[in-house]
Amino acid sequence: LYFSRDAYWEKLYVDQPAGTPLLYVHALRDAPEEVPSFRLGQHLYGTYRTRLHENNWICIQEDTGLLYLNRSLDRSSWEKLSGRNRGFPLLTVYLKVFLSPTSLREGECQWPGCARVYFSFFNTSFPACTSLKPRELCFPETRPSFRIRENRPPGTFHQFRLLPVQFLCPNISVAYRLLEGEGLPFRCAPDSLEVSTRWALDREQREKYELVAVCTVHAGAREEVVMVPFPVTVYDEDDSAPTFPAGVDTASAVVEFKRKEDTVVATLRVFDADVVPASGELVRRYTSTLLPGDTWTQQTFRVEHWPNETSVQANGSFVRATVHDYRLVLNRNLSISENRTMQLAVLVNDSDFQGPGAGVLLLHFNVSVLPVSLHLPSSYSLSVSRRARRFAQIGKVCVENCQAFSGINVQYELHSSGANCSTLGVVTSAEDTSGILFVNDTKALRRPKCAELHYMVVATNHQTSRQAQAQLLVTVEGLYVAEEAGCPLSCAVSKRRPECEECGGLGSPTGRCEWRQGDGKGITRNFSTCSPSTKTCPDGHCDVVETQDINICPQDCLRGSIVGGHEPGEPRGIKAGYGTCNCFPEEEKCFCEPEDIQDPLCDELCREQKLISEEDLGGEQKLISEEDLHHHHHH
């Protein structure tokens, strides 16, 4: 048995006479032989579920579900209840109604075995019948909505009449009907005004019925019509077996370059017309088991269940359904030497499915794991300026297909043929398994005899000790010009184009910082800034070379605070900035401020912003004072 609603609403007035009928609650059957028996909870509740008083006023007919006033609720009773409502005005009280046989303990009230009946209380006597508007004569203030389980016996789930109105205003005639299309499974009995289902409902055919209830009021010669929505929702049960969309029960996959733990190797989709079990229970009740194979397979793969609600068309309306994606996932990184082919089977069981038929499917995955060979081009040729600063990125080396690699560890090394000309370093980029070549020793660059640098690039997979090698020829170009004395270590410090371009900084391939002119479009990724190389900094990503020293590209790598209009990077740096952004790496601070506008008002605002920043910086104890910044701003 279950209630057709989880909440009912009616009005209560002071001194309404004992015996006044209030409303009917309705229970629907889960099985044909069930007979409902209704029971009221012992207490009345107020605001915030405050228990107000034992219920001495309202009774229920156990067999019919009729609630009625056993005794009149007088003003003094009402004041007593109000006094217990935690100081809130008592506007609404509620009772719990239980369906027997349910637990006799009055605890939480949860549908389907319990419903709440809310009474809106009016501190006046019942109004004169002639003063009631048609809407008040026809329907409760709160519009009802109904829930009916699919595949259950038909039954009565609503009664239209407002019983207190009928009882206290017998001279007013009220008639009801349901507007519904042809062939809908509901009827409204003209005499009893009871609404019932004609037959068992099927949620997979239709899930929602948006009916309209029509009420016609006759008072003397006057006739008025009131219409309200009358929505019915069909509740699901697990009556559909899982199936394969288009009959596809097998997926084939090749594991080659993507060998990282958690890589999705292949996916098979299962369709279920049901939307139960509910999401909280789904993974527990809708099980998937990788059928036992060899130990290697069990250790290497796992199956992940990803259910998703979808909607499908049925009889011209959309109903919800579930698609279950079963992903075959790598449980560990695979060695590049691994080479095998296997068939895996996954048993899917919709354990709540009651039949007919079986709620079990078998999924098949055919997987080939191919070995990966390390290959480098026969040689690389690059050039570097004698003026390049330390950490300047001058190129990349990459084993064949390295951009496609994941879960494959490749370490790059440089072996120099001339010990005194060992200028470059290499670091492996975690993103694409390439090796970034950078200037590590600027002194060697200046030596006249180091005009050509010869290296051997060695790429190694340490897990298998597999290697690849290539020659690297680096031509050193240009004349050495001494670093400018008095210039900052970091290009990012400079806030104006002229001062940016007159200095070099860490990471600069040309020995000069580069100015990136922003687009001036508010808080933008393309903010103006001074960079060692606009190819790599800022690009919203703190790369493996930039991590070596915060002075290279604080715009991408700073973990400190950013003052002014900006969007922080994830997990660090400036994702987007307003105007010009400059940074003081040792202060762990960046400032994003409007481009220079010769406007006194703006100037004052900027000044205020700087003052705020200055407090943030800790006053005179820090490297940057407000005046420094302010005058710098106008330089």
Partner: antibody, heavy 121, light 107 residues
Framework: QVQLVQSRDEVKKPGASVKVSCKAS????????ISWVRQAPGQGLEWMGW????????NYAQKVQDRVIMTTDTSTSTAYMELRSLRSDDTAVYFC??????????????WGQGTMVTVSS | DIQMTQSPSSLSASVGDRVTITCRAS??????LAWYQQKPGKVPKLLIY???TLQSGVPSRFSGSGSGTDFTLTISSLQPEDVATYYC?????????FGQGTKVEIK
Amino acid sequence: QVQLVQSRDEVKKPGASVKVSCKASGYTFTTYGISWVRQAPGQGLEWMGWINTYNGDTNYAQKVQDRVIMTTDTSTSTAYMELRSLRSDDTAVYFCAGARPLGGRRAFDIWGQGTMVTVSS
Amino acid sequence: DIQMTQSPSSLSASVGDRVTITCRASQGISHYLAWYQQKPGKVPKLLIYAASTLQSGVPSRFSGSGSGTDFTLTISSLQPEDVATYYCQKYNSVPWTFGQGTKVEIK
């Protein structure tokens, strides 16, 4: 607070060497270079040279370049200026000075307190 | 090397007077000129950098102007505490030469 603290005054004989230290505090030592400036009694300021505290690169004034060596010890945030083959006209107050990294080239806004080196037989 | 020449080498003025010191570079140095104040027995103090930008904490009666080869330091209203020697310095490239200094006294 940003400051440069120099070693105590020295008295040296002609032909000897002197090594003056300059300890930086309140900032990251490698973020800006240190210059050395001297001032003979009653005379003006004379720039002697500059060291890049990050990589050790140096630039020396022509007048002293054969006799001066500027070095740093980043572990102690200290810069050193060694002047060899001292003569009586090397008697002066020796200052270390730095420019805060506020973008572009900068003048000296931080100075050590000075070290008096007297060369006398 | 670029030479820096200051004039006058000394001057005497009354409190409240407007004082002007000039500095000439033997070749163009753009705006890379600084002015320092040194009081007797004290450390030099930066007043102006980039030819015209007032250093933080320096009174606004000090101002700088010029670009290229000719530069000026002006004290709009001389105060007793301004008695000192003033030096210009170029810093566009090494060597960072100083001028020979201008000694300012109160009449």
